[in-house]
């Protein structure tokens, strides 16, 4: 028997520095977690103690904090090189700055293979990107070899900016021939490493012949055997065992997100490459694990630029950006409109001629808007200003909801109106009319939504049974501010870009902004 230790991360999302327990900015260092310096300590400890160790990343290193905003992926390559990752799969967010923003900072700089078997380049890009990412890589580990085959969510064109010269194929269809190729090369221990979410991970384990282990990402899935060490609730045991169609027991793992945990899986193979046993658990990277001093020093060196960046002008406003709770929790506020407009703008993807865009709607809890921005400071808007408006380090995500769920959400928005509560919704691509004289749960008297399958966008009444795409904060997607119906009834949820980054990019693009209050949210009394 031969034993392999798989260390794995996924959806790190730019958390290079240690964070608080909820993966936001570290405030009290003695209670902070994660970060590459602490990760390195643990990885090195395991490398010294165990003979056959692989360190893998399942994608979405890109996007999530000011580190990515400033360094645009160079920080990912630099610190992953420093940690000596063995392989990485491409995630959807690796395409956030286009193919160019993947090639130059990451693919060019990485000293480890970057993988995806289901992304195929065509046209002029094919020769430019040839060899920069691979469908698979055979890695020597001790006296043996291990094949790593990569995959990426085929939804990436809807979630990011991969351009028109990359084709995202079905994961299972693309993986099988690559695994078969590895088998012909006499590689009998094969790990599928990828970024398509837990459901697809399980399908790959079930359907792709020859895959021994699946290491996934995208769905931020937390698996744990026994009593979990922090706040995350396990979606299943670690590893999650799937019985493949050909009768094998295939371990599937994921390690939550944000570098909070290091996935730790021990696999025992027989001489023919069959998995005999698998066990492990994610390791919580809490403050009991010291930060490696040399990596920490490097982080501090790179940090300097971030402080400079946060005070630079992004653009100007010529109007007061009303982000006060007195406005945003009671009525339409222009800060809400600005943020929603930025959210839609960030999700412009012309992937189908029938649609002007795949999504037109935005909702945003008024309680998530934490500060106004005064235009009388020469109109200057900085990252620092936006961090005061959006201080929670969330993301703006893409969900699919039925019209009936949206209707419930808007009823919830005003179910206890007047108490300055955070659930009052700001909107984009939606016209809503409330009648507060009616009883809670029956106050939405008009709800019109902007069409997507149209050449001239216009507002049509919401259809209860239709499925709509909506951009919203991850806080709402997770049922925050009492929006349990969104969490319970959403049909799909893909995590998006860092909230501040979305707004800062929009302001930089527009240069001068002047959002208005324009009748997106109205109140009426009496009949309609």
């Amino acid at each position: 028997a031969w034993e392999l230790t798989i260390l794995h991360t996924n959806d790190v999302h730019s958390r290079l520095e240690q964070t608080s327990e909820d993966s936001s900015k570290c405030v009290n260092a003695s209670r902070c977690m994660g970060g590459v310096a602490r990760l390195f300590t643990k990885v090195q400890q395991i490398r010294r103690a165990e003979p056959n160790v692989l360190l893998l990343d399942a994608g979405d290193q890109y996007q999530g904090t000011i580190w990515f905003t400033v360094y645009k992926g160079a920080e990912v390559a630099h610190f992953m090189n420093a940690l000596r990752y063995d392989a990485m799969a491409l995630g959807n967010h690796e395409f956030d700055n286009g193919v160019e923003g993947l090639i130059e900072p990451l693919l060019k700089e990485a000293k480890f293979p970057i993988l995806s078997a289901n992304i195929k380049a065509k046209g002029p890009l094919a020769s430019q990107i040839s060899g920069l990412y691979l469908p698979y890589k055979v890695l020597p580990v001790g006296d043996e070899v291990v094949g790593i085959v990569g995959y990426t969510s085929k939804e990436t064109p809807f979630l990011s900016n991969p351009g028109t010269n990359l084709v995202f194929e079905d994961e299972i269809t693309a993986l099988q021939p690559e695994v078969d190729k590895l088998k012909t090369l006499n590689v009998n221990k094969i790990i599928a490493l990828g970024h398509s979410g837990f459901e697809m991970d399980k399908l790959i384990a079930q359907k792709v012949r020859g895959v021994d282990v699946v290491v996934g990402g995208h769905s931020n899935t937390f698996l744990y055997t026994g009593n979990p060490p922090s706040k995350e609730v396990p979606a299943g045991k670690y590893p999650f065992i799937v019985t493949s169609d050909d009768g094998r027991k295939v371990p599937v793992v994921q390690a939550y997100a944000f570098g909070k945990y290091l996935g730790y899986l021990k696999i025992e193979f027989d001489e023919r490459g069959n998995v005999i046993s698998s066990h492990g658990n994610p390791i919580l990277l809490n403050s009991s694990i010291p930060e490696d001093p040399s990596i920490k020093a490097d982080i501090n060196k790179w940090r300097i630029k971030l402080d400079n960046y946060s005070t630079q002008e992004l653009g100007k406003t010529i109007v007061y950006l009303d982000g006060s709770s007195q406005s945003c929790r009671f009525r339409e506020c222009n800060m809400g409109n600005l943020i929603c407009d930025a959210m839609i703008n960030n999700n412009l993807r012309h992937t189908d001629e029938m649609f002007w865009n795949h999504v037109s709607m935005c909702i945003l809890n008024g309680g998530g808007i934490r500060s106004p921005i005064d235009e009388r400071n020469n109109g200057t808007i900085t990252w620092e200003n936006l961090a005061a408006v959006l201080p929670f380090g969330g993301t703006f995500d893409l969900v699919q909801l039925k019209g009936s769920t949206l209707k419930k959400a808007f009823e919830h928005s005003v179910h206890r109106y007047g108490q300055s509560t955070g659930e009052f919704l700001q909107v984009g691509g939606i016209h809503v009319v409330y009648d507060l004289s009616r009883k809670p749960g029956d106050r939405v008297v008009k709800l019109d939504v902007l069409c997507t399958k149209c050449r001239v966008p216009s507002y049509d009444p919401l259809k209860m049974d239709e499925v709509y795409k909506v951009i919203l904060p991850n806080f709402l997607a997770n049922g925050g501010d009492g929006f349990q119906m969104i969490k319970d009834e959403l049909l799909r949820h893909d995590s998006g870009d860092q909230d501040i980054n979305v707004v800062s990019t929009y302001i930089s693009k527009m240069k001068v902004i002047y959002p208005a209050v324009e009748g997106r949210i109205k109140f009426s009394t009496g009949s309609h």
Partner: antibody, heavy 123, light 108 residues
């Protein structure tokens, strides 16, 4: 306007020393790797040395290793090349060049070049 | 070190001609190749990076192709201002930068 201006060239005897400077303007100097490239009279281009944006990675051509030292002062937007133990074969126009990629640690293409400064090593 | 070999070392052409210069690397360098133009007494100017990407401000008559070891710079219709010396340069990861010996494009 993005600009690189070299200075410090001149006539020096074999075994002597010279310090070249390159003043940068019009771009955020400390975002980019910088390089020295030279061109002997009537000959082609030869890369001499490079330094990454935060001075962590420094490289030299074998022909100058141990004799030349590249450095940068990001607060002054200036790149330097300290040349010691100069030889006749070091005679060339020395160009300062900027890497086109931000924060790179590995080799890149050079999108901005200075006008060059002539170094003549002769007795 | 990786050697870069350009051919031809010089060529004569007329305004309006299609001109092709090739560059061969002694080992695989992926797409990490740049092309520069240099006029007498002037600094080189970047034309193409990553084998085929046109630097901003460079006329579209210049194009690059190739990957691996064999690369080509094409000027689709030679203009009077294009008479110069052209250099290729490899910048493959973690190996020193090396230039080709140059190709001089002269008026026929």
């Amino acid at each position: 306007e993005v600009q690189l201006v070299e200075s410090g060239g001149g006539l020096v005897q074999p075994g002597g020393s010279l310090r070249l400077s390159c003043a940068a303007s019009g771009f955020t100097f400390d975002d980019y790797a910088m390089h020295w490239v030279r061109q002997a009279p009537g000959k082609g281009l030869e890369w001499v040395s490079g330094i990454n944006w935060n001075s962590d990675n420094i490289d030299y051509a074998d022909s100058v290793k141990g004799r030349f030292t590249i450095s940068r002062d990001n607060s002054k937007n200036t790149l330097y090349l300290q040349m010691n133990s100069l030889r006749a074969e070091d005679t060339a126009v020395y160009y300062c060049a900027k890497d086109r990629r931000k924060y790179s640690n590995s080799p890149g293409a050079f999108d901005i070049w200075g006008q060059g400064t002539l170094v003549t090593v002769s007795s | 070190d990786i050697q870069m070999t350009q051919s031809p070392s010089s060529l004569s052409a007329s305004v309006g001609d299609r001109v092709t210069i090739t560059c061969r690397a002694s080992q695989i360098i992926g797409p990490w190749l740049a092309w520069y133009q240099q006029k007498p007494g002037k600094a080189p100017k970047l034309l193409i990076y990553r084998a085929s990407s046109l630097e901003s401000g460079v006329p579209s008559r210049f194009s690059g192709s190739g990957s691996g070891t064999d690369f080509t710079l094409t000027i689709s219709s030679l203009q009077p201002e294009d008479f110069a010396t052209y250099y290729c340069q490899q910048y493959n990861s973690y190996s020193p930068w090396t230039f080709g010996q140059g190709t001089k494009v002269e008026i026929k």
